[in-house]
Interface confidence: low
Amino acid sequence: QLLEPCGYIYPEFPVVQRGSNFTAICVLKEACLQHYYVNASYIVWKTNHAAVPREQVTVINRTTSSVTFTDVVLPSVQLTCNILSFGQIEQNVYGVTMLSGFPPDKPTNLTCIVNEGKNMLCQWDPGRETYLETNYTLKSEWATEKFPDCQSKHGTSCMVSYMPTYYVNIEVWVEAENALGKVSSESINFDPVDKVKPT
């Protein structure tokens, strides 16, 4: 009984820019080849349980097969590598989830308001939908101090946990990061006293 996977798909956590091409490889372990009396030409690739056309598949050597997708558009695809063994019985070798989306846009229109004696709320426009898990972090500093980062829950605003110091200019910007890239907004510089919201 083979308890370990019969092989692996690389990359193991594929994230692809939507509209681009993508190639994955499946590498069979030597023990698997011998156990099932197969080689890489016996590999069947599947996406969401449907067989991938043979013209997208290349047998590289006896252990390795590759599959290429052009113009990837689906946000999430289950990609599996399978082998046809004894009398066409299909055995799953390995599976990965292929995600597609966009790198984050540069956040724009960053603005902040101060709730006197409490906290500061900053908001921004994140740009187009990325279709991927994207983290937005509000960063701030001034000449002699780095303030704590603020992790945005919604991707469009963040309430900072510190009370900003008045009468000194602070610098604030937003960083956006996902598996396809990292970018920041332009920084804004202001004295928090000028951003106090009238009560």
């Epitope: 500093e141 890239g181 970018v183 920084s187």
Partner: nanobody
Framework: QVQLQESGGGLVQPGGSLRLSCAAS?????TYWMYWVRQAPGKGPEW???????????YYADSVKGRFTISRDNAKNTVYLQMNSLKPEDTAVYYC?????????????????TGQGTQVTVSS
């Protein structure tokens, strides 16, 4: 005239150290994020490191993380790159650049560097 002048490069043995400097003139360094970008012979430019305006937020390419340290002295209008544990693959011309914001540029998007740069050669 806006200018960035790199210096401090040289020939060093593997495992050695160098400190690069970039002096800005014609503009106030503290209003810009600063970057180091390198270009090896026959290769495209590679983003190495970035430092925020105040100097508290620093970023590094995976290939140099833990070995290089970027810093800045806004009073002296200078940005530095301390390079330790140098490897032959660090051999390149190093350029400093400025920007109004931070970009973790992917490999195919690094802007082509301009200026002289400073040559770093790591060889035994």
């Amino acid at each position: 005239q806006v200018q960035l002048q790199e210096s401090g490069g040289g020939l060093v043995q593997p495992g050695g150290s160098l400190r690069l400097s970039c002096a800005a003139s014609g503009f106030t360094l503290s209003t810009y994020w600063m970057y180091w970008v390198r270009q090896a012979p026959g290769k495209g430019p590679e983003w190495v490191s970035a430092v925020s305006r105040g100097g508290f937020n620093t970023y590094y390419a995976d290939s140099v993380k833990g070995r290089f340290t970027i810093s800045r002295d806004n009073a002296k209008n200078t940005v530095y790159l301390q390079m330790n544990s140098l490897k032959p693959e660090d051999t390149a011309v190093y350029y400093c650049m400025s920007s109004v914001s931070f970009y973790g540029w992917p490999p195919d998007r690094v802007p082509s560097p301009t200026g002289q740069g400073t040559q770093v050669t790591v060889s035994s």
